[in-house]
């Protein structure tokens, strides 16, 4: 194929790949008709003047995962057709001025995972056709004004995983075509008002894992096309009332891992497209009426690992499409009987790790599609008669680690568990806590003939009792709810996967569906 270097492989499709530790310089001679060249995992430490001079038809050049620390300014001379250039995962600390001069066709420039200490306006001033610029995983401490002023066609800019402590409000002002801006994992403490005003086409803004304490009220008011906003793992303690008011296209908002103490009614919205709202690991203590009422299409609401002790009966008004509600690991002692009444499409609810002492008989009365209820590790001694009767799709119920009182009043719950066991998975069985003569015994195998008569009047539900085990040939499909593998945080759907750390941390939100989380 027009002379392929021995250290490389060359395909008929004009693709050349050179890999291996024994390569210490750009191999020669490279086929003159090469359109794609990859130099990966070598010991090349520098690029000298014009090593690619004879392959002017090159469209894509990947020089990744090498020992590259020095590049001569004329290294990419004569590559006027080059559209894609990656220098990612090398050891570059400095970029020579003029390095990208003459790369008039360049659309994607990947400089991620190096050791770059600074960038200057002159670095990219010739790259007027650039659409994608990846600078994440470097050591940048600031971005000078004008650094991106010539990149008017830029649609994706990743500055994540650097050491940025502040951002100038003018640095992005000319990026009117930008769709994706990533600033995650820096040291930003605040974002000046107006920083994002020029980004009228922005669809994704990633600000997670910084140290942001305050959001300016109008910070996002010009970003009407924003679809994904990641604000998790910051120090945000309050949300200005109008901060999310102008985001009608938003479909993903993460606020977990902040210091939010309260949520005011109407703070979210209108956001007719928001499907998921992640608020776990904050300091929220109560939920007022109508706090989520603008989120008509919300399907996933994660409020776990807060300090919620009170939920107003109308807190979940408007959430008619909600499928998953996570309230686990809070301080709930009581729930109003109507609190879930509007959640007609709810499938999974996690209430474990609270202090619930009792549940109203009608708590799930209107939530007929529930498939999973998690109530383990509360202070429940019994449950009202008929509480699950109408839940024909229920196929996971967790009740263990509660102080069940196994007197005669427990019989309806015991019978329900026994008669419905094929629908309820094989989780840990509930165990009696009292009276003393049955402590430690499984609730479903206590000897009913020595069960102590109750000394109080059991609660009777106010809604009609209906059979919960309808006489059908088979139980509901227990595979309809997937495994309980849970993810630590929303996977923030990046093409550069360096930020994603998926774990199997069952403690985070305790749902039954593995969310892209």
């Amino acid at each position: 194929y027009h002379g392929c270097p021995s250290e490389c492989t060359c395909s008929r499709a004009s693709q050349v790949e050179c890999t291996g530790a024994r390569i210490v310089a750009v191999p020669t001679p490279l086929p003159w008709n090469a359109m794609s060249l990859q130099i990966l995992n070598t010991h090349i430490t520098e690029l000298n003047e014009s090593p690619f001079l004879n392959i002017s038809a090159l469209i894509a050049l990947r020089i990744e995962k090498n020992e590259l620390s020095r590049i001569t300014p004329g290294a990419f001379r004569n590559l006027g057709s080059l559209r894609y250039l990656s220098l990612a995962n090398n050891k570059l600390q400095v970029l020579p001025i003029g390095l990208f001069q003459g790369l008039d066709s360049l659309e994607s420039l990947l400089l991620s995972s190096n050791q770059l200490l600074q960038i200057q306006p002159a670095h990219f001033s010739q790259c007027s056709n650039l659409k994608e610029l990846q600078l994440h995983g470097n050591h940048l401490e600031y971005i000078p004004d004008g650094a991106f002023d010539h990149l008017v066609g830029l649609t994706k800019l990743n500055l994540g995983k650097n050491s940025l402590t502040h951002i100038s409000p003018r640095v992005f002002q000319h990026l009117g075509n930008l769709q994706v801006l990533r600033l995650y994992e820096n040291r930003l403490t605040d974002i000046p008002m107006g920083t994002f005003d020029g980004l009228v086409n922005l669809q994704e803004l990633a600000l997670q894992q910084n140290q942001i304490g305050l959001l300016s009220p109008g910070l996002f008011h010009n970003n009407h096309n924003l679809q994904r906003l990641y604000l998790s793992n910051n120090h945000i303690s309050q949300l200005p009332p109008s901060v999310f008011m102008q985001l009608p296209q938003l479909n993903r908002l993460t606020l977990f891992g902040n210091s939010l103490k309260e949520l005011s009614p109407g703070i979210f919205g209108p956001m007719p497209n928001l499907r998921e709202l992640w608020l776990y690991d904050n300091h929220i203590s109560s939920l007022p009426d109508n706090v989520f009422s603008n989120l008509r299409q919300l399907q996933v609401l994660i409020l776990s690992r807060n300090q919620i002790s009170f939920i107003s009966p109308g807190a979940f008004n408007g959430l008619t499409e909600l499928r998953e509600l996570s309230l686990h690991t809070n301080a709930l002692q009581d729930l109003d009987g109507n609190v879930f009444r509007m959640l007609a499409n709810l499938q999974n609810i996690s209430l474990q790790n609270n202090r619930l002492r009792q549940l109203p008989g009608n708590i799930f009365a209107n939530v007929n599609g529930l498939m999973a209820i998690q109530l383990q590790n509360n202070q429940l001694e019994n449950l009202p008669l008929g509480i699950f009767d109408h839940l024909g799709k229920l196929c996971e119920l967790r009740l263990y680690d509660n102080p069940w009182r196994c007197d005669s009043d427990i019989l309806p719950l015991r019978n329900w568990l026994l008669l419905n066991q094929p629908r309820l998975g094989t989780d840990t069985v509930p165990v009696c806590f009292s009276p003393a003569n049955v402590r430690g015994q499984s609730l479903i195998i206590i000897n009913v003939n020595v069960a102590v008569p109750s000394v109080h009047v059991p609660e009777v539900p106010s809604y009609p009792e209906t059979p919960w085990y309808p006489d059908t040939p088979s139980y509901p499909d227990t595979t309809s709810v997937s495994s309980t593998t849970e993810l630590t945080s929303p996977v923030e759907d990046y093409t550069d996967l360096t930020t994603i750390q998926v774990t199997d941390d069952r403690s985070v939100w305790g749902m039954t569906q593995a969310q892209s989380g």
């Epitope: 005669s408 019989l411 309806p412 019978n415 026994l418 008669l419 066991q421 094929p422 094989t426 989780d427 840990t428 069985v429 499984s442 479903i444 195998i445 009913v448 003939n449 009792e465 059979p467 919960w468 085990y469 309808p470 006489d471």
Partner: antibody, heavy 113, light 111 residues
């Protein structure tokens, strides 16, 4: 003490129906399941159905021919069998609780022309 | 349906000796870590009587000489010291899922 008192023996013709009863005493009727079990002469035991708070579950072999009902005010469970044949001649027991911990004395059904 | 197979069909044991009856289920009858296997005794002309529930728990008023063991698919009823009043037919039964099914029975006699 817990007791399940079943109705007396029945002699019926093929094609007819029969309704037998099981009256519970000595415990809270609504707190326990009532099962029905069939035993043909000299044979083993076969589960028919259960009823609990008006909810029922049937063995497919008896679906459509056995109907379980109960009267909470009299603490009595009933089983009706229809379209009877000689194969239905058997002793029918009611039993209490999920684990069948107490049994009635049985109702003998004879189907003969 | 879960099929329950008892063995032996009949068993003759001397008074005071141990009697062992086996029961095998066609699939596991375990749930929640509990085996939903029950044993009943039926004497001639009488209804069955619950001896053992959930594999190893004694029913009310059942003498200590009756014990149950096993998990999954294989279970055993043991009469540690056979008494004359133990002459009966013994049935195993699974209550893991509907239809609840019984074994064919084991007749225990005095040798």
């Amino acid at each position: 003490q817990v007791q399940l008192q079943q109705s007396g023996p029945e002699l019926v013709k093929p094609g007819a129906s029969v309704k037998m009863s099981c009256k519970a005493s000595g415990y809270t009727f609504t707190s326990f399941v009532i099962h029905w079990v069939k035993q043909m002469p000299g044979q083993g035991l076969e589960w028919i159905s259960y009823i609990y708070n008006d909810g029922t579950k049937y063995n497919e072999r008896f679906r459509g021919r056995a109907t379980l009902t109960s009267d909470k005010s009299s603490s009595t469970a009933y089983m009706e069998l229809n379209s009877l044949t000689s194969e239905d001649s058997a002793v029918y027991y009611c039993a209490r609780d999920y684990y069948f911990d107490y049994w009635g004395q049985g109702t003998t059904l004879t189907v003969s022309s | 349906d879960i099929v329950m197979t008892q063995s032996p069909d009949s068993l003759a044991v001397s008074l005071g000796e141990r009697a062992t009856i086996n029961c095998r289920a066609s699939e596991s009858v375990d749930y929640y870590g509990i085996s939903f296997m029950n044993w009943y005794q039926q004497k001639p002309g009488q209804p069955p009587k619950l001896l053992i529930y959930a594999a190893s728990n004694q029913g009310s008023g059942v003498p200590d000489r009756f014990s149950g063991s096993g998990s999954g698919t294989d279970f055993t009823l043991t009469i540690s010291s056979l008494q004359a009043e133990d002459v009966a037919v013994y049935y195993c039964q699974q209550s893991k899922e509907v239809p609840y099914t019984f074994g064919g029975g084991t007749k225990v006699e005095i040798k």
